[in-house]
């Protein structure tokens, strides 16, 4: 009922609560004196549902047979109409449809650590839109019972509150759960079990990590566990990676020893544990434990590159570069390279600690067989050295590589391909392609980079600090025993149209004709390898096409000479570049009036 | 146990606008329906307005396309928002939650609508 109803009563027969899918008879019924004033069968009593008409009836009470109602709960409220007012609310009453409770399924209980509570869960089944009631009981040995009630709508959880204790470890223990609502009950399967079958540890805590004598081969992990812990699984991985390496250990107490770990590498470790070989449940995983393994002596060695350079008559320029060492291979934080230059008749040795740098320059006399050793050093000790002779890496032109070229390979990558060279190519023992940023006047200061190359491969794609729209000097030297040969080419992984022409910056008259001298187009603007220049020329106020002349580019150059001019006939000229993808725009404009002779 | 607590009421001229809230304690909230109604001095407590859990709402005649009735069942809160109001809305306005158990009410707010 919806309250006091003062003017009439609304009933609901069999039930206010119906089980979905059943009918209902609903009946209104005025309460004496309590219908139109004048004349009762004036009345028309109306049943709504919810803000819906679906009945009326004129006189004293109304019957109405109602089917289809869904899930939930529906008001039906009666109205009374009489001529010339409004329709006046007599009663109103809500049905509430619903489903008796499915079984519940699944029913497990835990007790989280020795000194834990019993807690179970169950899955409810389908909603059944009534208040459902859910009732778990334990029972025990000795006829031992524990009941508790869930008032929660969504109840599928209780926790006894109750601690099992390991003094009779097989006893068994069982569990149900009991829903009720107005439409029915169900219970569940019971659930059995021994206090073994129910306590998941704790997960272990206090982790520690201890390397004996620094070293990651001596590495134990200890840590802490309930008493009655028998079982642990143990889990590590680099921190950078996603793979966990599991181990399984029995009776361990606490701790045990790693033997596969890499130096100098932070790992993650946890920790699981469990109470019996095949009963109970793993304990969640542990808190994380980070820590670093110590650093082992580097293995591997330095890949080592030189480059050579004439100073004068007596003396040359001698550039080492190398690739650190890969993280595996390092073992530690390299605190210093270790570069030993060796003159192998005198027996003259020179060492000398780099650090914060991967080269080294030094000024050497152009007599003598110098050799160099490069080794990494960290904490622990130093890589093998690799030792190179210092060679003249162009002299041998019989072992140069045959018709090399530079190629674009998709974004930031050359394919630089070659031939093997003309003398015995098996005599090759590796080839060695070589890059770095062309820059006018040949700056030594431009980063170097290098990869090596098997001796049967002839092509290598370097990807390796390559900038789109930049040229790039490329060198490909085959290597055999103490002799080099090489070959060079320029390169570009992308190009387009030089942003700017060169600028002229004089004109100077020679025996009738003229000499041009430019300004290197800035690098930023050459927007890759520049294949030629073009020199213009036209009379001045005519509008005859100009003339031009093409020159190959060369790096060092920057001035022409032109003999094609008329004497006192002033000329305009200027000069653009061109790549392979196009011409550049003008560079600037210059006046100039051959003094000379006519020829 | 189920408790509700309406708030918002007041004094509103003619024409004015009021924002009833009702909030309920317990957990039943999300599977039933809650109403509003009204009791004018005199007269007896007539229903205004439902909303089922899944947020369908349904008006009596007098309130219809004046009034507004929604829920947040995260705050377990229910609302009437009253535009247009008259005088004939004058009463002690009161949640509801039904329940086949029996029905939960509010303690009521006055609704006073005059010049």
């Known amino acids: 009922k919806i309250d006091a109803c003062k003017r009439g009563d609304v009933t609901v027969k069999p039930s206010h609560v119906i089980l979905l899918g059943s009918t209902v008879n609903i009946t209104c019924s005025l309460k004496p004196r309590q219908g139109c004033f004048h004349y009762s069968r004036r009345n028309k009593l109306i049943l709504y549902k919810f803000d819906r008409r679906i009945n009326f009836h004129h006189g004293h009470s109304l019957n109405s047979q109602v089917t289809g109602l869904p899930l939930g709960t529906t008001l039906f409220v009666c109205k009374l109409a009489c001529i010339n007012s409004d329709e006046i609310q007599i009663c109103g009453a809500e049905i509430f449809v619903g489903v008796a409770p499915e079984q519940p399924q699944n029913l497990s209980c835990i007790q989280k650590g020795e000194q834990g509570t019993v807690a179970c869960t169950w899955e409810r089944g389908r909603d059944t839109h009534l208040y459902t009631e859910y009732t778990l009981q334990l029972s025990g040995p000795k006829n031992l019972t524990w009941q508790k009630q869930c008032k929660d709508i969504y109840c599928d959880y209780l926790d006894f509150g109750i601690n099992l204790t390991p003094e009779s470890p097989e006893s068994n223990f069982t569990a149900k759960v009991t829903a009720v609502n107005s439409l029915g009950s169900s219970s569940s399967l019971p659930s059995t079990f021994t206090f073994l079958d129910i306590v998941r540890p704790l997960p272990p805590w206090d982790i520690r990590i201890k390397f004996q004598k620094a070293s990651v081969s001596r590495c134990t992990l200890y840590w802490r566990d309930e008493g009655l812990v028998l079982l642990n699984r143990l889990r590590y991985r680099p921190s950078n990676s996603r793979l966990w390496n599991m181990v399984n250990v029995t009776k361990a107490k606490g701790r045990h020893d790693l033997l596969d770990l890499k130096p100098f590498t932070e790992y993650e470790f946890q920790i699981s544990s469990k109470l019996h070989l095949y009963k109970g449940s793993w304990s969640d995983w542990s808190e994380s434990l980070r820590a670093q393994t110590p650093e082992e002596e580097p293995t591997g060695m330095l890949d080592v590159w030189y480059m050579k350079r004439h100073i004068d008559y007596s003396r040359q320029q001698i550039s080492l570069f190398w690739k650190n060492l890969s993280v595996s291979e390092a073992r530690g934080k390299i605190l210093h390279y270790q570069v030993t230059l060796q003159e192998l008749t005198g027996g003259k040795a020179m060492t000398q600690n780099i650090t914060g740098h991967t080269s080294w320059t030094t000024v050497i006399p152009r007599t003598g067989n110098w050799a160099v050793a490069v080794s990494a050093a960290n904490s622990k000790g130093s890589s093998l050295p690799t030792r190179i002779n210092i060679m003249n890496l162009c002299e041998a032109g019989l072992l140069a590589p045959r018709q090399v070229s530079a190629n674009s390979e998709g974004m930031d990558n050359i394919l630089v391909t070659w031939q093997p060279p003309r003398k015995d190519p098996s005599a090759v023992q590796e080839y060695v392609v070589e890059w770095r940023e062309l820059h006018p006047g040949g700056d030594t200061q431009v980063p170097l980079n290098w990869l090596r190359s098997r001796p049967y491969n002839v092509s290598a794609l370097i990807s390796e600090n390559i900038k789109s729209y930049i040229c790039y000097e490329i060198r490909v030297y085959a290597l055999s025993g103490d002799q080099g040969g090489c070959s060079s080419i320029l390169g570009n992984s992308k190009h387009k149209a030089p942003l700017s022409g060169p600028h002229i910056n004089a004109i100077t008259e020679e025996k009738g004709s003229i000499l041009i001298s430019w300004n290197s187009i800035p690098v930023q603007e050459q927007m890759g390898c520049l294949l030629h220049y073009r020199i213009y020329w036209k009379e001045r106020d005519s509008n005859s096409q100009p003339q031009l002349c093409e020159i190959p580019y060369r790096v060092s150059q920057n001035s022409h000479p032109i003999n094609s001019l008329q004497p006192r006939v002033t000329y305009v000229l200027w000069m653009t570049a061109l790549t392979a993808a196009g011409e550049s725009s003008h560079g600037n404009e210059r006046e100039f009036c051959l003094q000379g002779k006519a020829n | 146990q189920v408790q509700l607590q309406e708030s918002g009421g007041g004094l509103v001229q003619p024409g004015g606008s009021l924002r009833l809230s009702c909030t309920a304690s317990?957990?039943?909230?999300?599977?039933?329906?809650m109403d509003w109604y009204r009791q004018a001095p005199g007269n007896q407590r007539e229903w205004v307005a439902s909303i089922t859990p899944s947020g369908d709402p349904y008006y009596d005649d007098s309130a219809k396309g004046r009034f507004t009735i929604s829920r947040d069942n995260a705050k377990m809160t229910v609302y009437l928002q009253m535009n247009s109001l008259k005088p004939e809305d004058t009463a002690v306005y009161y949640c509801k939650v039904p329940t086949e158990k029996g029905n939960y009410w509010g303690q009521g707010t006055q609704v006073t609508v005059s010049s």
């Open positions: 317990g957990s039943i909230f999300s599977i039933y329906n």
